[in-house]
Interface confidence: low
């Protein structure tokens, strides 16, 4: 190889060892039979050399630096050439560096030909290995503007006081042009301006200078976005940190054409604007930092540009002004993340503050809209607290647990509507009465409706799940001792059509000691499957539950247990079951930790099944599944 550098070129070439790799054999640069691991060629020098190995690209890298001085003479503006030509260089990973020094009053503009640039962050790399690293200067301090790949939206970067531009080309890359030109501009009075041009739908991730380290103190950086008029842009902050400010406040400012409040000032922790039509600017302004404990300001954000959807022009009013202790959250369904461009899916408050999820609280009317390609990507979760603090006022008071019709007007699917029912401890209990009798979901007879009620204790220390219940069964009411949450969970869009089948009434009733009481009126046509709460995890220690099973006069009930034995092992206390005829009060007691469960038995009258747990040994829990069937009486036994 021969490299000759003209005396006036201001170019230096450096060949040096690259990142160490585990290679069996070393490789050297050979100059006049001498071996070296570094070669520096200065302006006016001409050097002949070769390598001692077949694949020098595995060992060495080459840096070509050109210093451009715009302080003492005219600046060579225009398209930047690769010098020396890549065809004259050895096939090593090469980095071309242009170091431009200029006066503070001169603005320098880097213009990138198509394909434009895409900024990437720490831990990322470019598919083709071609990277641009761009730095600026503040007095003597170098500031990293960012590292970029091809195929992006960044078309121009304006700086002042100097630019250091590095283009990294892998050894195998055939590129022989720099892909950018330099122009002079008037002073920009800030660290830099980055222009990002969108031709159509897409996204761009951008970062503050020096990211992920701190943005320079009290500096200003601007991004200019050029957006086709028919598209909409939304900004979301992916990652940010605030420094400790002594004077002024760190903020972002938006200049949005057509806005009457330009510039619009936001804190970094605010929800950022969405659904913006047309071009806009975003500026990051730092502050004077605390000298003792400065902290760092940094920002990584995404601009998403997409077609406005039909829904984005509609405003939906969610009226929670008459609701109390209610919150409604619209959020993304959990789905697999795809690697290709996925249009954003945002919910917007007052059409401007857009985010991937939104929580609305009671006491107000809210206006919302959507900026989303497919609203099935979102769902809605609602929580409502119904609490009683004064037992004298609440007793016998009833509330309807019904999804408000307002919610059905929204174009997103309801996932969960949870009512938290809170009662004064040891003073009141609760009873749930469904509009349609309920079926308990079991493996043997699963629910196949579009929604279910999930009933669980709402006492933080208590892990008690009563079960999942859906309309179309035999359970007439569920009484519970204390605080519970009732969650209506939907499983299919057809819930909207089946909404009339929902409806539970909760009443506050005098306190009772059992954890739960289920009132069951079996249907003559089918088996009623019932199981103990906390199925699969076991009935909690020392918990008691009962089933009040009604037997019509002309029927006989057969009570059957799924297993011969419960398998419960008591650490302390006893686990037992009482089956009591309601008419005669005759009862049988079974020790669940010792006795076998009773064989199928017939009841001619209504009866109780009561199960009380001991403190079971770990892994030997109490789970019981039983069923009741009705058959017509053949002989009147009354």
């Amino acid at each position: 190889f021969e490299i000759a550098l003209p005396r006036e070129s201001n170019i230096t070439v450096l060949i040096k060892l690259g990142t160490p790799t585990l290679l069996a054999k070393p490789c050297y640069i050979v100059i006049s039979k001498r071996h070296t691991t570094m070669l520096s060629i200065k302006p006016g020098e001409r050097i002949l050399f070769t390598f001692s190995c077949q694949s020098p690209e595995n060992h060495f890298v080459i840096e070509i630096q050109k210093n451009i001085d715009c302080m003492s003479g005219p600046c060579p503006f225009g398209e930047v050439q690769l010098q020396p030509s890549t065809s004259l260089l050895p096939t090593l990973n090469r980095t071309f560096i242009w170091d431009v020094k200029a006066h503070k009053s001169i603005g320098l503009e880097l213009q990138f030909s198509i394909p434009r640039l895409r900024q990437f962050g720490p831990g990322e790399s470019c598919p083709d290995g071609v990277t641009y690293s761009i730095s600026g200067r503040i007095d003597a301090t170098v500031v990293r503007i960012g590292t970029f790949c091809s195929n992006g939206t960044v078309s121009r970067i304006k700086m002042q006081e100097g630019v250091k531009m590095a283009l990294h080309l892998p050894w195998f890359h055939p590129r022989n042009v720099s892909g950018f030109s330099i122009a002079n501009r008037s002073s920009i009075k800030r660290l830099c301006i980055i222009e990002s041009v969108f031709e159509g739908e897409g996204s761009a991730t951008l970062m503050s200078a020096n990211y992920p380290e701190g943005f320079p103190e009290d500096e200003l950086m601007t991004w200019q976005f050029v957006i086709p008029a028919h598209l909409r842009a939304s900004v979301s902050f992916l990652n940010f940190n605030l420094s400790n400010c002594e004077r002024k406040e760190e903020r972002v400012e938006y200049y949005i054409p057509g806005s009457t409040t330009n510039p619009e000032v936001f804190k970094l922790e605010d929800k950022q604007p969405g659904n913006m039509a047309g071009n806009f600017n975003l500026s990051l302004q730092g502050c004077d930092q605390d000298a003792q404990n400065p902290g760092i300001l940094r920002l990584q954000f995404q601009v998403l540009v997409q077609h406005p959807q039909n829904e984005s022009n509609k405003i939906y009013v969610v009226d929670l002004s008459n609701e109390r202790a209610t919150s409604l959250t619209i959020e993304p369904r959990p789905v697999k993340q795809s690697r290709k461009f996925v249009p954003g899916c945002f919910v917007c408050l007052e059409s401007r503050t857009c985010s991937t999820n939104l929580t609305l609280t009671s006491g107000s009317k809210h206006k919302i809209s959507f900026l989303c390609d497919n609203l099935t990507r979102l769902w809605m979760n609602v929580e409502k607290n119904i609490s009683c603090t004064d037992h004298r006022y609440c007793q016998r008071k009833s509330y309807s647990l019904q999804v408000p019709s307002d919610i059905f007007h929204l174009p997103v699917e309801l996932h969960d509507f949870s009512w938290k029912l809170l009662v004064p401890k040891d003073r009141l209990s609760l009873v749930l009465v469904p509009a349609q009798k309920l079926q308990q979901h079991t493996h043997e007879k699963p629910c196949n409706t579009s929604f279910s009620y999930l009933v669980a204790s709402a006492i933080p220390s208590q892990d008690l799940y009563f079960g999942s219940f859906c309309p179309g069964g035999s359970i007439e009411q569920i009484q519970v001792k204390q605080n519970i949450s009732v969650t209506l969970r939907t499983f299919a869009p057809s819930f909207r059509q089946e909404a009339s089948r929902q409806g539970l009434t909760v009443s506050f009733i005098p306190y009772f000691k059992e954890e739960g009481v289920f009132t069951v009126t079996p249907d003559t046509k089918s088996k009623v499957y019932l199981r103990t709460p906390n199925w699969d995890r076991g009935l909690p220690s020392l918990t008691s539950v009962s089933w009040n099973i009604s037997v019509p006069r002309d029927q006989v009930a057969c009570l059957t247990f799924f297993k011969e034995r419960t398998g419960v092992v008591c650490q302390t206390g006893r686990a037992f079951m009482i089956i009591q005829e309601q008419r005669t009060r005759a009862e049988e007691i079974f020790s669940l930790d010792e006795d076998a469960l009773p064989k199928p038995r017939f009841h001619h009258h209504s009866f109780w099944v009561n199960i009380s747990n001991c403190s079971p040994a770990s892994g030997k829990q109490l789970d019981l599944l039983f069923w009741v069937t009705l058959t017509p009486r053949t002989v009147d036994l009354t």
């Epitope: 720490p122 831990g123 992916l238 959990p334 697999k336």
Partner: antibody, heavy 116, light 108 residues
Amino acid sequence: EVQLVESGGGLVQPGGSLRLSCAASGFNISYYYMHWVRQAPGKGLEWVASIYSSYGYTSYADSVKGRFTISADTSKNTAYLQMNSLRAEDTAVYYCARVYYGFDYWGQGTLVTVSS
Amino acid sequence: DIQMTQSPSSLSASVGDRVTITCRASQSVSSAVAWYQQKPGKAPKLLIYSASSLYSGVPSRFSGSRSGTDFTLTISSLQPEDFATYYCQQSYYVYPITFGQGTKVEIK
């Protein structure tokens, strides 16, 4: 060099709590999904929970939902697993792992024993 | 949840043998399957990602392939250090991530 170091394991009674830590070095946990995977003695691998702290995404296996909480402190470059209401069946070696191509970096594991 | 059924649960082989372990997904998981090696008392190590891509630093005797919902890990010539337990794992639906039951490769 990428490294993950778990700590916080030990013996705890059923119903008790533990907090596991996973200190990462050589990379920024903000940019990666961080996971906890456990392995009961003599058994296979079971995914427990994951977090992507930049987006605040968390997810849990059904077996731990409501009892375990995954979190991260990006300033300390550390992920955590808060385990409440522990049961005997939670006894396992708990590994913290980084995910990119797959679970490409794992910690050495920390043993959690739940026993009375 | 997607189940990953791995077979066999154990196998005996000699140094130099060609070893094949298979995993069947209960539904389509695209190519989102990885394979791991685990030695007693150690954390698992990633061998293959995206069904067939060899992870950096992994010897080329390990390879992965896919046919529909069937995934195969092949060790072309078993070495003494390859005696270990191997697991497949899917992450097509990000959650829950599921692993196969494991295959223990023992010395014959």
